[in-house]
């Protein structure tokens, strides 16, 4: 069984989520990759994807999401800029490998976006918020639509574990087939 884990990011409106998803270089370098949100009780929804085949270090921008696939490093970089409270949720990277179902990359990202600057531990009350406007200069790629009724999977339950520290890791559940997920736009 595979241990499904997630890392929690607590950010403020206007900030940037900047994360990486590692993948096996030899196997997936040119495969199309996607960034998905998983809402409770729903299928994962693809928000952005790289081109097909995926181009090395070529930024793809969909709204406030920027994807960069570094083939030579075996990592997909995902940035969500100018975060909004509504961006809060559980996210994951997947690799498209038709005709097979998408392959999920670990770890998942639990994003919590809050308004303003509160006095929570590890943050600062008097910092000014950054609202950064990104120029729409990059490419938007079309994401494939996958349907696969036999892998309908509910999103994992929200963990009640204390995950306030950077090293926190939530062990959601032991799963076997959950790593293959269908994708809906």
């Amino acid at each position: 069984a595979t241990k499904l884990t997630e890392e929690k990011y607590e950010l403020k409106e206007g900030q940037t989520l900047d994360v990486k998803c590692d993948y096996t270089l030899e196997k997936f370098a040119s495969s199309q990759k996607a960034w998905q949100i998983i809402r409770d009780g729903e299928m994962p929804k693809t928000l952005a994807c790289t081109e097909r085949p995926s181009k090395n270090s070529h930024p793809v921008q969909v709204g406030r999401i920027i994807l960069e696939d570094y083939h030579d490093h075996g990592l997909l970089r995902v940035r969500m800029v100018n975060l909004q409270v509504e961006d809060s949720g559980l996210y994951q990277c997947v690799i498209y490998q038709p005709p097979k179902e998408p392959h999920m990359l670990f770890d998942r990202i639990r994003l919590v976006v809050t308004k303003g600057f509160s006095g929570t531990p590890g943050s600062n009350e008097n910092s000014t918020q950054n609202v950064y406007k990104i120029p729409p200069t990059t490419t938007k790629a079309l994401c494939p639509l996958y349907t696969s009724p036999r892998t309908v999977t509910q999103a994992p339950p929200k963990s009640t574990a204390d995950v306030s520290t950077p090293d926190s890791e939530i062990n959601l559940t032991n799963v076997t087939d959950i790593i293959r997920v269908p994708v809906f736009n």
């Epitope: 890392e7 950010l11 403020k12 900030q15 940037t16 900047d18 994360v19 990486k20 998803c21 590692d22 096996t24 270089l25 270090s57 920027i66 570094y70 490093h73 075996g74 990592l75 940035r79 800029v81 770890d107 990202i109 600057f117 943050s123 600062n124 910092s127 950054n130 950064y132 990104i134 950077p166 090293d167 890791e169």
Partner: antibody, heavy 121, light 105 residues
């Protein structure tokens, strides 16, 4: 607790190679990138590259391409940085550092104590 | 190649506020970290994700960002804060600013 312990100081002649080790403890070695940063006397921090201990893959700063090799031995949770064709301006303290999280490349929350490498004829 | 620009030096009187800036292209899209380094010691992370403090870092250290400029602010500066400070960001590669020497007069 997380610890990165580096090998001792080295004195090398120009043209030689040096291999610095960084032994990790207190966490799952495969889960976090290890970076190498150097600092010449009186100078700032200079990033040399990162190592993905899980895959063994590395990413080197352009300046060091062709001269640096980063490897690891997962059985002993140790990362290595080898710099070849040493010159006098490679004299510096070399640090290994660990990512704060598994899903980010920066910042570096944990640092080794540093290894002084002196290149002198 | 990507560069982060810091002032070489900043001076402040004890108890006053010190501000160190770091600017770079598209820094608004990137998370900024700040490190403190005292002579003969390894760097210490004092701010990450623009404005968060790791545990153990005093509250007088704060970070902010406006557009493409990040700022490290030390309020009520103490003699022990005298050190070199470096900003850091991830472009295609990891980049450090040139460093700022903070002198507490």
């Amino acid at each position: 607790q997380v610890q990165l312990v580096q090998s001792g100081a080295e004195v090398k002649k120009p043209g030689a190679s040096v291999k610095v080790s960084c032994k990790a403890s207190g966490y799952t070695f495969n889960g976090y990138y290890i970076h190498w940063v150097r600092q010449a006397p009186g100078q700032g921090l200079e990033w040399m590259g990162w190592l993905n201990p899980n895959s063994g893959g590395a990413n080197y700063a352009q300046k060091f391409q062709g001269r640096v090799t980063m490897t690891r031995d997962t059985s002993i949770s140790t990362a290595y940085m080898e710099l070849s064709r040493l010159r006098s301006d490679d004299t510096a303290v070399y640090y290994c550092a660990r990512d704060q999280r598994k899903t980010t490349v920066t910042p570096f929350e944990y640092w080794g104590q540093g290894t002084l490498v002196t290149v002198s004829s | 190649s990507y560069e982060l620009t810091q002032p070489p030096s900043v001076s402040v009187s004890p108890g006053q506020t010190a501000s160190i800036t770091c600017s770079g292209d598209k820094l608004g899209e990137r998370n900024v970290g700040w490190y403190q380094q005292k002579p003969g010691q390894s760097p210490v992370l004092v701010i990450y994700q623009d404005n968060k403090r790791p545990s153990g870092i005093p509250e007088r250290f704060s970070g902010s960002k406006s557009g493409n400029t990040a700022t490290l602010t030390i309020s009520g500066t103490q003699a022990m804060d005298e050190a070199d400070y470096y900003c850091q960001a991830w472009d295609r590669n990891v980049v450090f600013g040139g460093g700022t020497k903070l002198t507490v007069l």
